[in-house]
């Protein structure tokens, strides 16, 4: 048969952050090419990344159609010069991916502190509401639009002059915290989805400190 030197893909892995979703697999092809198909549990298979020598395929456009659906992908292997060729059972070799539910499993990207503003003994810290590739009515939704109150942010803050940290939570993108007048503070935030069992927390944002560009001070 024409598939004697064709090997099935393996280690199929979903890599997804803020719904940007790529399927990766092995091995690097030698005299073979790959095509990927994706479907929901009840839907039809859709082919992507036709006859590619890559070992990854960006499936974002498919999964953002409904991020709460559960998806399955499969990777077909074909001989490089003869993509019409099939395996011994009359089917090309393929391997299934694990199931993937974007809403429950996409990693939360590192958040960014957009700004902070001090008014007297209060500081308003605002977290950037990152745009995703999820669309509704032809507009891209933000992370908050997609997750709503399921997404919270944890703020860590501390006086620049000491190591003792404090924390606060919000299910919006804003914190209003009490500070000591005349003290400079540093801030870092983390995104969390409490209801999840996997990929629950993001990495911490870069630290931002008062007395630097992002801040504003009003008496």
């Amino acid at each position: 048969s024409g598939t004697t030197n064709t090997v099935a893909a393996y280690n199929l892995t979903w890599k997804s952050t803020n719904f940007k979703t790529i399927l990766e697999w092995e091995p690097k092809p030698v005299n073979q090419v790959y095509t990927v198909q994706i479907s929901t549990k009840s839907g039809d298979w859709k082919s992507k990344c036709f006859y590619t020598t890559d070992t990854e395929c960006d499936l974002t456009d498919e999964i953002v159609k409904d991020v709460k659906q559960t998806y399955l992908a499969r990777v077909f292997s074909y001989p490089a010069g003869n993509v019409e060729s099939t395996g011994s059972a009359g089917e090309p070799l393929y391997e299934n991916s694990p199931e993937f539910t974007p809403y429950l499993e996409t990693n939360l990207g590192q958040p960014t502190i957009q700004s902070f503003e001090q008014v007297g003994t209060k500081v308003n810290v605002t977290v950037e509401d990152e745009r995703t590739l999820v669309r509704r009515n032809n507009t891209f939704l933000s992370l908050r639009d997609v997750f709503g109150k399921d997404l919270i942010y944890t703020l860590y803050y501390w006086k620049s002059s000491s190591s003792g940290k404090k924390t606060a939570k919000t299910n919006t993108n804003e914190f209003l915290i009490d500070v000591d007048k005349g003290e400079n503070y540093c801030f870092s935030v983390q995104a969390v989805i409490p209801s999840r069992t996997v990929n629950r927390k993001s990495t911490d944002s870069p630290v931002e400190c008062m007395g630097q560009e992002k801040g504003e001070f009003r008496e």
Partner: antibody, heavy 117, light 107 residues
């Protein structure tokens, strides 16, 4: 099955030190926040502090900041409470608890620390 | 720091009674409040989170209400297994603080 098991409690003299352990099973501690809460005999619950085991961030009630240190070893799936300069008023049952960021859903059975000469 | 004032500190009630326990925060904590039940010699058990959401496996006779500074735990019809001490916890900002507890005793 999710389980938290505290150990390391016992009798210690005033001024002494003790390290409590909270061994977790059934989940990965780095995916959650881990807290220590204590309860003096016949009294209410008192929050001690938390750790995010993934990045080592710790938060304490200021009254414990100078004497207590929370740490975690993700390879052992265990959180720790190091207590120094212990006083009679630190006598309590010490609990560890898992925090989803919305609530403390699992608690250990507690370990009794008695500070007495 | 946020103070949580819980009342009453104790109450006597009979099986079937409706019981209400309140917690007042010294400032706005939005809905970052949970309620726990503790029996002697045991660890606390989660009842209510986000002020109003019933935790998994908790009987529907327990309910929570409130947001901002005023919160209530209600047991609609007290059962024998409900005699215990109840605590509120604010976790909106550190230091997290518990209420002083309410001991529900048999009348």
């Amino acid at each position: 099955e999710v389980q938290l098991v505290e150990s390391g409690g016992g009798l210690v003299q005033p001024g002494g030190s003790l390290r409590l352990s909270c061994a977790a099973s059934g989940f990965n501690i780095k995916d959650y926040y881990m807290h220590w809460v204590r309860q003096a005999p016949g009294k209410g619950l008192e929050w001690v502090g938390w750790i995010d085991p993934e990045n080592g961030n710790t938060i304490y009630d200021p009254k414990f900041q100078d004497r207590f240190t929370i740490s975690a070893d993700t390879s052992k799936n265990t959180a720790y409470l190091q207590m120094n300069s212990l006083r009679a008023e630190d006598t309590a049952v010490y609990y560890c608890a898992r925090d989803t960021a919305a609530y403390f859903d699992y608690w250990g059975q507690g370990t009794l620390v008695t500070v007495s000469s | 720091d946020i103070q949580m004032t819980q009342s009453p500190s104790s109450l006597s009630a009979s099986v079937g009674d409706r019981v209400t326990i309140t917690c007042k925060a010294s400032r706005d904590i939005k809905s970052y409040l949970s309620w726990y039940q503790q029996k002697p010699g045991k660890a606390p058990k989660l009842l209510i989170y986000y002020a109003t959401s019933l935790a998994d496996g908790v009987p529907s006779r327990f309910s929570g209400s409130g947001s901002g500074t005023d919160f209530t735990l209600t047991i609609s019809s007290l059962q024998p297994e409900d005699f215990a001490t109840y605590y509120c916890l604010q976790h909106g900002e550190s230091p997290f603080t518990f209420g002083q507890g309410t001991k529900v005793e048999i009348k």
